[in-house]
């Protein structure tokens, strides 16, 4: 059986008003006001279950219940509730009407009764403009009287002594003589407690901690020079002696340097001063996590909530009979707790506002064994908004897809657990994908054909009724390639350019009325599209940077068949660098000279339009330059043996040389030197 501990809607205030101050019972109106701005209406009840009326909340978040002239049928105890969209408040204080010509019965209450301390008695009188009188049992005359002071009065006993103990009641009366009196309030017994009021007790960090965390408990009271005791599960575990040094409030800090799994539990504290002890503090539940598997947290009906509406967060655990806690990122203490017999708990966030947006998580823990807790659930983002955020639509691996290949369109956004809908321009029906716990929606298109190309957008599609506005994503253009002859792509002034320089990529097609699309390997979307008047598009790249390096290609499509694109141009590698990459150097047929045979050294670089130079043992080789990178070496008198490397420079930038290649060693054939011999 689940024990509901919903954070209650704050209780409303009930009072009475009249336009006959000398005889209020001639025309009485009860008013109910709520401190909660999300109150929709008010209900007035009589004697607990008699439904008197329901009225909508005014702009001042209150409602009037006119009773008119009091009759015998009006006698009874009234209270009101405020009513929100999905919750009813605690009842107001009860207003008792005891007769047809008598004021409502007041209610008396008091602050803690501590010897030697000031005590305040509150008398709530319901009607404004009344006088108040405080009575003590056994005394004929009022102990104190106060004039018209609003709907309630505070009587003060300066210093509580034994003689002040006893039963007190209060009465209200009309402002002008002859006074008309109320019945006395129910009596309140004042007994001096040999106890101080409870201390204020808290943890400095969250009371939900991971093993090894540092925890400080703070116990404080306004009373001076107190000693403190710390309890765990009712047993004393630490104490702190009084401090005479500091005037004013007393406080003690209890530190656990490194929390262990057995340190969880219910902590409380008390303070004392010689023979007088305080009441125990409210307990703090310290929960040590990471003992049980993590729960899952889901939002119902969904994680996006219209302001003023309510949402249920369901924490699904693994074991029965645990206690659950709901946490919000940035909040010091858990927002709510639930003790359940099952393995899940529902937390209601009612009438949410913008401040309720954020990441929520939950844990569960056992209350019998040191509050051993689970890992935290994965965070769940709750959005309180009247408009869904825009999702982002993109294609993987690219929005430019060769005919027959596969592509996945991803609709991705920050909201988890919501469905997505994919819409193609010009089509009546949309593809739907219900979101799961992941925060993205995949729409796979296999074996792509011409029917798949076009403009797409997507939006969130919650599977619950919602007044939250939906925004479409960006538009994604899906091009299918391989349907026209390929264009050519070249770089001006060349494929290598220094950082900060400008370059132009020229895509040359064969057909008129074409739109050209520039692509870069690794990019999911085209870099740029152009519709030139001629057959060529010039893609201007000003002030290039290192990240502009890469492999480029281009395609084109015709005005008459947009999105049906050509084959890709040949790839073009662009280098943005001050130092061109080093070439490679190899020997053909091998690095070993054979008698009378030459060796060709082949220097190869990644860029076209270059001039190569060869170095031999650190000096320029006799055949110094080559445009194709081939150098022929002979071994006349053994001079060809040694270490070679090569470099190149771009014809467009003759002052910039590449790094040298890795060195390559040429050697002579092993064995005795060959002798010439003649046959005589």
């Amino acid at each position: 059986e689940e024990t509901e501990i919903v954070m209650p809607t704050p209780k409303p205030e009930l009072w009475a008003e009249t336009n006959f101050p000398l005889a209020p019972w001639k025309n009485l109106t009860l008013w109910c006001r709520s401190p909660s701005g999300s109150t929709k209406e008010f209900v007035l009840l009589k004697d607990g279950t008699g439904w008197i009326a329901t009225r909508p909340a005014s702009e001042q978040v209150r409602a009037a219940f006119p009773l008119g002239a009091l009759t015998q049928s009006h006698t009874g105890s009234y209270h009101c509730h405020s009513w929100e969209e999905m919750a009813v408040s605690e009842p107001s204080e009860a207003l008792e009407l005891v007769g047809t010509d008598i004021l409502p019965k007041p209610v008396i209450s008091a602050s803690p009764t501590i010897r030697g301390q000031e005590l305040q008695l509150r008398c709530k009188g319901w009607l404004a403009g009344m006088g108040f009188a405080l009575y003590k049992e056994g005394e004929q005359e009022p102990v104190q009287q106060l004039g018209a002071v609003g709907r309630e009065a505070f009587f003060t006993i300066q210093r509580m002594e034994d003689k002040d103990e006893g039963n007190y009641s209060c009465r209200t009366h009309t402002e002008k003589r002859p006074f008309k009196w109320s019945e006395p309030s129910e009596p309140l017994e004042l007994v001096i407690k040999e106890m101080y009021p409870k201390p204020f007790f808290k943890t400095w960090a969250s009371p939900v901690v991971t093993p090894g965390a540092r925890v400080t408990f703070n116990c404080s009271t306004p009373h001076q020079h107190m000693s403190f005791i710390l309890y765990k599960d009712g047993s004393e575990i630490a104490s702190s002696d009084r401090s005479w040094a500091s005037p004013g409030a007393s406080a003690a800090h209890f530190l656990i340097i490194s929390v262990g799994i057995g340190d969880g539990g219910n902590y409380s504290c008390r303070y004392y001063d010689f023979s007088i002890w305080s009441e125990p503090s409210d307990p703090v539940e310290l929960v040590v996590t990471e003992f049980y598997p993590k729960p899952t947290l889901l939002a119902q009906p969904g994680p996006v909530v219209f302001p003023g509406k309510s949402v249920i967060l369901r924490c699904q655990g693994t074991f029965q009979g645990m206690r659950f806690a709901l946490l919000q990122e940035g909040a010091h203490v858990p927002l709510q707790f639930r003790s359940v017999s099952g393995n899940s708990a529902d937390f209601l966030l009612h009438t949410v506002g913008a401040e309720d947006s954020g990441n929520y998580s939950c844990i569960y823990y056992e209350t019998t064994m040191s509050n051993r807790g689970s890992y935290l659930s994965m965070p769940l983002m709750i959005w309180v908004t009247d408009t869904f955020p825009k999702p982002w639509l993109f294609a993987e691996p690219s929005s430019v897809v060769p005919m027959g290949q596969n592509v996945t369109l991803w609709c991705r956004g920050p909201v988890h657990g919501v469905g997505y809908i994919l819409h193609k321009e010009g089509e009546a029906t949309s593809m739907q994908l219900w979101g799961s716990t992941s925060n993205d929606g995949a729409f796979p298109i296999t074996n792509i054909s011409g029917t798949s190309m076009g403009r797409y957008s997507c939006c969130y599609h919650p599977d619950w009724t919602s007044s939250i506005k939906i925004q479409p994503s960006n538009t994604l253009e899906l091009l299918v390639t391989g349907l026209l002859p390929k264009p050519s792509l070249l770089a001006q002034p060349g494929p290598m350019v220094a950082p900060g320089e400008n370059m132009t990529l020229q895509c040359q097609g064969e057909l008129p009325d074409s739109t050209f699309v520039l692509l870069k390997e690794g990019a999911q979307e085209p870099l740029e599209q152009q519709r030139p008047s001629g057959y060529r598009a010039d893609f201007w790249m000003p002030a290039v940077r290192g990240e502009d390096s890469g492999i480029y290609s281009c395609v084109y499509y015709l005005d008459s068949t947009p999105f049906a694109a050509s084959n890709h141009s040949d790839s073009l590698e662009i280098w943005v660098t001050d130092k061109p990459p080093k070439p490679s150097l190899s020997a053909w047929p091998s690095t070993m000279f054979k008698l009378g045979k030459d060796i060709t050294l082949q220097c190869r670089g990644p860029l076209p339009g270059v001039e190569f130079v060869l170095e031999h043992d650190g000096e320029e080789a006799p055949q110094q330059f080559s445009e194709d990178g081939d150098f022929v070496i002979n071994n006349v008198e053994g001079k060809g043996i040694g270490n070679y490397s090569c470099s190149y420079r771009l014809q467009a930038y003759p002052d910039i040389w590449s790094e040298p290649s890795d060195p390559l060693e040429l050697v002579g054939a092993a064995g005795p030197v060959a002798q010439e011999c003649t046959v005589g």
Epitope: K40, L45, G48, G50, W51, R55, P56, M86, V88
Partner: antibody, heavy 117, light 112 residues
Framework: QMQLVQSGAEVKKPGSSVKVSCKAS????????ISWVRQAPGQGLEWMGG????????NYAQRFQGRVTMTADESTTTAYMELSGLRSEDTAVYYC??????????WGHGTLITVSS | DIVMTQTPLSLPVTPGQPASISCKSS???????????LDWYLQKPGQSPQLLIY???HRASGVPDRFSGSGSGTDFTLKISRVEADDVGLYYC?????????FGQGTKVEIK
């Protein structure tokens, strides 16, 4: 969309009692009042009383006081109306209706109770 | 109890023409909060009643703007600007200012 589903038609003897149920689904049950309205054959509508399930609070029309009892079970989101001491003039269609301060916005389909010896 | 009186009890109408129903209460339905607690309901043949207008002049969700409510104190009117064939049925006014809530006797709207 809120739905109020009522129990089926019944034939009762004079002097007996009848208990009509009204099950709410697709909306928030506890946060509304449920009223019971009856309509005798060929006649107009007559409000019998109402209940606020979350508070267990009721109000009965004076002419049904002592004969009618309205209850609600929050766990099953069902409201009940029991009418005792049945007479032939209690033959009517009995409706449940959900309401707050803006009228009865959802109605059940009605339950015909026939009182006949 | 507050007595609600409707006129006429029967109203033959022509589609496309306006129609109006009157309702009088035996005491004022104007509350001190400024609201007038009068509602209008339509019961189509063989169906449950449905809410048309609440708190004097507020149209219920999904109700066409052909329907409007007006009045003050003790005299109230429901107007249909252009009657449609689907508008036939019994129209009831109901007061909600105090318990017990009470209905008018009903006005039967039928096509001529």
């Amino acid at each position: 969309q809120m739905q109020l589903v009522q129990s089926g038609a019944e034939v009762k003897k004079p002097g007996s009692s009848v208990k009509v149920s009204c099950k709410a689904s697709g909306g928030t049950f506890s946060s509304y009042a449920i009223s019971w309205v009856r309509q005798a054959p060929g006649q107009g509508l007559e409000w019998m009383g109402g209940i606020i399930p979350v508070l267990g609070a009721t109000n009965y029309a004076q002419r049904f006081q002592g004969r009618v009892t309205m209850t609600a079970d929050e766990s099953t989101t069902t409201a009940y109306m029991e009418l005792s001491g049945l007479r032939s003039e209690d033959t009517a269609v009995y409706y449940c209706a959900r309401g707050r301060s803006w009228g009865f916005d959802y109605w059940g389909h009605g339950t015909l109770i026939t009182v006949s010896s | 109890d507050i007595v609600m009186t409707q006129t006429p009890l029967s109203l033959p109408v022509t589609p496309g023409q306006p129609a109006s129903i009157s309702c009088k209460s035996s005491q004022s339905l104007l509350h001190s909060d400024g609201n007038t607690y009068l509602d209008w309901y339509l019961q189509k043949p063989g169906q449950s009643p449905q809410l048309l207008i609440y708190t004097l002049s507020h149209r219920a969700s999904g109700v066409p703007d052909r329907f409007s409510g007006s009045g003050s104190g003790t005299d109230f009117t429901l107007k249909i600007s252009r009657v449609e064939a689907d508008d036939v049925g019994l129209y009831y006014c109901m007061q909600r200012i105090e318990f017990p809530y009470t209905f008018g006797q009903g006005t039967k709207v039928e096509i001529k």
